[in-house]
Amino acid sequence: FNISGCSTKKLLWTYSTRSEEEFVLFCDLPEPQKSHFCHRNRLSPKQVPEHLPFMGSNDLSDVQWYQQPSNGDPLEDIRKSYPHIIQDKCTLHFLTPGVNNSGSYICRPKMIKSPYDVACCVKMILEVKPQTNASCEYSASHKQDLLLGSTGSISCPSLSCQSDAQSPAVTWYKNGKLLSVERSNRIVVDEVYDYHQGTYVCDYTQSDTVSSWTVRAVVQVRTIVGDTKLKPDILDPVEDTLEVELGKPLTISCKARFGFERVFNPVIKWYIKDSDLEWEVSVPEAKSIKSTLKDEIIERNIILEKVTQRDLRRKFVCFVQNSIGNTTQSVQLKEKRG
């Protein structure tokens, strides 16, 4: 199709080489079409404006994204050619940063139902650049935490070094929905609830004498509880002896509950004590079996191919540790009688 009639938007993504970060493009179809498609301007499907020049489907994923190759080749369907780019409804998610993401991206409705619809498309010219050195030493992270129940704020990474007074007008989105209230480079949250968690996007316009473009950054916000003040506790094994059959395989599980820590480095390992000697056992990787806002339960198993007489003289010790302290639980094997 002819893209010369598409409305054009220029965007800049300046990414930090120090951190992982994502990026998004919204299918900003010209008003009033976009409301009909993605409902980003908060109309319900029943409240479609009258006299729509473009009567598309109400299916939220009913847009098609393309990339325009720089060599003039035909448009490429994003889903077929770019595994690191994911389409979610009307949003294109870039999972990894890099200058190779620079280019022109076009979105338009899949269903073309009238002659007006041909021009119902948006061309987004994306420029991707690495952040230049320490233009701002303490720029906000693309991953920000809010402490539940307290006051917090979400900062726009590309503007966090500017004071509120010099900050340009910022457009904020949360999970793809425009936050029409917010205007500054920081969203202040008086009391943090779990619904404040999500993907936030901040946009502002930068201009020079020739043109203007939108500078965009994406912030992943999670709501967290305060760091635990407790060392981890071992849920299993509970008993310090375990009846076993000689010659049979045996798996002993160690399950431990770790309280939430913002910087989470849990340790869970097995070691064996045999008279005066003790050594760590190489066992399968630990796995998280339950994760909640407040804590995480991690399990690690020790596997014996077959229980020997020597194993009955040993103590099998599960050791768990967080930044507060450590806990151990030892198990002595006992031969089953009869």
Epitope: R42, A165, L178, S180, S184
Partner: antibody, heavy 115, light 111 residues
């Protein structure tokens, strides 16, 4: 500052466009809202146009009004006025920290809808 | 749609007294605190007094204060002056802009 214009006497059903002219600031940086007040009554929030171009309307105002803008003006179109639309119409600018704290208001323009 | 109920509709106060105006929202406002208070005198546009429930707007005397308890918001005028005679409105801003609305207004008469 902001100033409204275009208020006049119209007959029911005749579309009317009111204009809000901004000076001393850029509409590409501030959200603008329209508020009205019928004679002797309270304030009613009509809608907003965001600097990004996004528009939103109060549930009662949807379909009855359209807000649009140019680089220096914001328009409010009353699509099919009825006598109940007789009021003083104000435009108001959003604040620096927030788009809904209206710290700059126009003096208002009076619209009278009558047969 | 959300409902903002402002009470009382009219209140009379002596100079130096205290006036309390309430605004009850049927549901949480945006971010739990997005409610503003405006003062309007006859023939004039409204004037912003309080935003974000309790923040005093620039140039507004400190005798005006705002507070919140859940979905109830209160405007207090301590040490009322003759110049405070006006109608006061609350404006609630919600997650869905279609719900944004002013309260019905409270007329303050100063004796």
């Amino acid at each position: 500052s902001v100033e409204e214009s275009g208020g006049r006497l119209v007959t029911p059903g005749t579309p009317l466009t009111l204009t809000c002219t901004a000076s001393g600031f850029s509409l590409s940086s501030y959200a603008m809202s329209w508020v009205r007040q019928a004679p002797g009554k309270g304030l009613e929030w009509i809608g907003i146009i965001h600097y990004s171009g996004y528009t939103a309307y109060a549930s009662w105002a949807k379909g009855r009004f359209t807000i649009s803008k140019t680089s220096t003006t914001v328009d409010l179109k009353i699509t099919s006025p009825t006598t109940e639309d007789t009021a003083t119409y104000f435009c108001a600018r959003g604040g620096d920290a927030d788009n809904f704290y209206y710290n700059i208001w126009g003096p208002g323009t009076l619209v009278t809808v009558s047969l | 749609a959300q409902v903002l109920t402002q009470t009382p509709s009219s209140v009379s106060a002596a100079v130096g007294g205290t006036v309390t105006i309430n605004c009850q929202s049927s549901q949480s406002v945006y971010s739990n605190n997005h409610l503003a208070w405006y003062q309007q005198k006859p023939g004039q546009p409204p004037n912003l007094l309080i935003y974000r429930a309790s923040k005093l707007a620039s140039g507004v005397p400190s005798r005006f204060s705002g507070s919140r308890s859940g979905t109830q918001f209160t405007l207090t005028i301590s040490g009322v002056q003759c110049d405070d005679a006006a109608t006061y409105y609350c404006l609630g801003v919600y997650d869905d802009d279609a719900d944004n609305a002013f309260g019905g207004g409270t007329e303050v008469v100063v004796k």
